[in-house]
């Protein structure tokens, strides 16, 4: 019998300074590119080695980005979200949601569409 898997969801404000090669991460999601079923949110899909996000260390693959410089990312087309990041300036404030898998019982199983990495 599988153990139950719960998720600890936390939010964090992350302030990044744009580096020589930018912020250094990739995103998926948007109203036209849903990555998680019934969720058009924006998720971090890649942290680039030695980029600003990697050097800061707080942003993780699988994190959901809720806002950029106070601007909500709800109900945005994918490319509009990309453009928002690209035009966000030198100092970028990200409100992010971390989702940490917490296993209860002997065996854990990640549900379909779970973005956590």
């Amino acid at each position: 019998m599988n153990g139950r898997v719960d998720y600890l969801v936390t939010e964090e404000e992350i302030n990044l300074t744009r580096g020589p090669s930018g912020l250094g991460f990739n995103i998926v999601g948007g109203t036209d590119q849903q990555y998680v079923s019934n969720d058009s949110g924006i998720y971090v899909s890649r942290i680039k080695e030695n980029g600003a996000a990697a050097l800061d260390g707080r942003l993780q693959e699988g994190d959901k980005i809720l806002s950029v410089n106070g601007q909500d990312l709800k109900n945005l087309l994918h490319q509009d979200a990309v453009d928002l990041f690209r035009n966000a300036g030198y100092a970028v404030s990200l409100r992010v949601q971390h989702r940490l898998q917490v296993q209860n019982g002997p065996i854990g199983h990640r549900g379909e569409g779970d973005p956590s990495g």
């Epitope: 090669s21 930018g22 912020l23 250094g24 991460f25 990739n26 995103i27 998926v28 990555y35 998720y43 971090v44 899909s45 890649r46 942290i47 680039k48 080695e49 693959e61 699988g62 994918h78 490319q79 990309v82 990041f85 690209r86 990640r110 569409g113 779970d114 973005p115 956590s116 990495g117």
Partner: nanobody
Framework: HVQLVESGGGLVQAGGSLRLSCAAS????????MGWFRQRPGKERDVVAT????????YYLDSVKGRFTISRDNAKNTVFLQMNSLKPEDTAVYYC??????????????????????WGQGTQVTVS
């Protein structure tokens, strides 16, 4: 982190076929760009074929176009490389590679087009 395990390599005669498989674990497969690279004896590692996270964009090395096909099965967390009409010059260690897909939030450049973050141990393909 992502763990990648290749299989399907072996010894085959020229003109024959092999199908390489790469099983991925450690994070949701559906968000990963996947690639196959090869390292021939005495040469540097070269990209052979890539497929993006949505499966709608592929790339092939010129010398394998029309002979090799990359595909993915998200339900099985696996990427495949079907290799037909194999030639002795295809002899190499073949490596599976992965990286997070999606769009860079930075301006896109060709620099880094074939930069991958996670690598398998490789599987030997020998064409005699």
């Amino acid at each position: 982190h992502v763990q990648l395990v290749e299989s399907g390599g072996g010894l085959v005669q020229a003109g024959g076929s092999l199908r390489l498989s790469c099983a991925a674990s450690g994070r949701p497969f559906s968000s990963l760009d996947m690639g196959w690279f090869r390292q021939r004896p005495g040469k540097e590692r070269d990209v052979v074929a890539t497929i993006n996270w949505t499966g709608d964009s592929t790339y092939y090395l010129d010398s394998v176009k029309g002979r090799f096909t990359i595909s993915r099965d998200n339900a099985k967390n696996t990427v495949f490389l079907q290799m037909n009409s194999l030639k002795p010059e295809d002899t190499a260690v073949y490596y599976c590679a992965a990286r997070g897909g999606g769009s860079s939030v930075d301006s896109e450049y060709d620099v880094g087009k074939f930069e991958y973050d996670y690598w398998g141990q490789g599987t030997q393909v020998t064409v005699s």
